[in-house]
């Protein structure tokens, strides 16, 4: 907290319930519980802010749409030059059509080549995917059993050799109070043994430890 005061100090005390005389009192009591913190913004202001936010969002969307239109226009203007027909006659227009047809043919050729490459890549991807599935099939997955595992065992399983070091460290730390608590541990251990025997955990535990 910036000012260092507690939440309780800042929270206003619940106002006493109004005297139940008029229906308006009941309405007020039902619609706005007095224990609730009163809003500092009026409903009309809230509406005004909401409208403003919506307006800003709308403007943003319109701007984005305009940007996209502009981008499209720019892209088209670089790819498709405007036809400059002033002063050109039938002969030139005929030749221009020839030029444009030649350009279209060239683009079509390029498109065909690209499509062929894409098709080849798709086929290769499909083949590789199939190989992955085939390889997966060759190795039989072991059936997994739910086992109860201690945090240390979990760490050892996950971290391997590095976990062993951290476990040793922990063991070293525990050694300090070991003598004092040995007696307690024994009692606790006996009690735990009884519970394990009752719940059938003893067998499972042995299985896991082996």
């Amino acid at each position: 907290m910036a000012d260092g005061s507690s939440d309780a100090a800042r929270e206003p005390r619940p106002a006493p319930a109004p005297i139940r005389r008029r229906s308006s009192n009941y309405r007020a009591y039902a619609t706005e519980p007095h224990a609730k913190k009163k809003s500092k913004i009026s409903a009309s202001r809230k509406l005004q802010l909401k409208t403003l936010l919506l307006q800003i969002a709308k403007q943003e969307l319109e701007r984005e749409a305009e940007e996209r239109r502009g981008e499209k226009g720019r892209a088209l203007s670089t790819r498709c030059q405007p036809l400059e027909l002033a002063g050109l006659g039938f002969a030139e227009l005929q030749d221009l059509c020839r030029q444009l047809h030649a350009r279209v043919d060239k683009v079509d050729e390029e498109r065909y080549d690209i499509e062929a490459k894409v098709t080849k890549n798709i086929t290769e991807i499909a083949d590789l995917t199939q190989k992955i599935f085939d390889l997966r099939g060759k190795f039989k997955r072991p059936t997994l059993r739910r086992v109860r595992i201690s945090a240390d065992a979990m760490m050892q399983a996950l971290l391997g050799a590095r976990a062993k070091e951290s476990l040793d460290l922990r063991a070293h730390l525990k050694q300090v109070k070991k003598e004092d608590t040995e007696k307690e541990n024994r009692e606790v251990g006996d009690w735990r043994k009884n519970i394990d025997a009752l719940s059938g955990m003893e067998g499972r535990k042995k299985k896991f430890e082996s």
Partner: antibody
């Protein structure tokens, strides 16, 4: 008054290169297609190149295609003809002309005075 | 390429004469034919476009006609300033081609 003034002509050896210029005035240059036409020493007129008003499209006869390049600078109201790998048969008076059209019929309505190009060894 | 040919390379006429210069195309050029005049000083001017349309500033003594492959330019009432070489040009197909020209001389 519509006017075209060619410059850049000269005498050069076969295989040489030259760039002709044509300064246009008296009309809205960027609204018109432009052409180069040459007249051989035998007085034959030969169309050499045409460029569209904005410079996007150009047209050439096979005799100069790949060797000559027509271009324009609409800001400077100037037309150019870059000539490479010149041959003796390119010797001619080179005219710059404004293009116009009427119902699909295109024509050269105004011509410059010409610029002489001589290719000789 | 479309070949353009004129019936004669030169013509002799007297002032005030009516002169007709012919031009033939190797194939139908659908009226896309223009006529140019080149003066002895080398200046070139457009006279007629699209077979029969007179270019602005050109005397009404000049007229054009024809269709398909055959076209002609007529000068009525020949004047001294008309002494020049006349070229026809087709605008139907690229490459644009001119004829060899007809040189008009005074008798």
């Amino acid at each position: 008054e519509v006017q075209m003034v060619e410059s850049g002509g000269g005498l050069l050896k076969p295989g040489g290169s030259l760039k002709l210029s044509c300064a246009a005035s008296g009309f809205t240059y960027s609204n018109y297609a432009m052409s180069w036409v040459r007249q051989t020493p035998e007085k034959r007129l030969e169309w050499v190149a045409t460029i569209s008003s904005g410079g996007s499209y150009s047209y050439y006869p096979d005799s100069v295609k790949g060797r000559f390049t027509i271009s324009r600078d609409n800001a400077k109201n100037t037309l150019y003809l870059q000539m490479l790998s010149l041959r003796s048969e390119d010797t001619a008076m080179y005219y710059c002309a404004r293009r116009d059209n009427y119902y699909g019929s295109s024509f050269m309505d105004y011509w410059g005075q010409g610029s002489s190009v001589t290719v000789s060894s | 390429d479309i070949q353009m040919t004129q019936t004669s390379s030169s013509l002799s006429a007297s002032l005030g004469d009516r002169v007709t210069i012919s031009c033939r195309a190797s194939q139908d050029i659908t009226n896309y034919l223009n006529w140019y005049q080149q003066k002895p000083d080398g200046t070139i001017k457009l006279l007629i476009y699209y077979t029969s349309r007179i270019h602005s500033g050109v005397s009404s003594r000049f007229s054009g006609s024809g269709s398909g492959t055959d076209y002609s330019l007529t000068i009525s009432n020949l004047e001294q300033e008309d002494i020049a070489t006349y070229f026809c040009q087709q605008g139907n197909t690229i490459p644009l081609t001119f004829d060899t020209g007809t040189k008009l001389e005074l008798k």
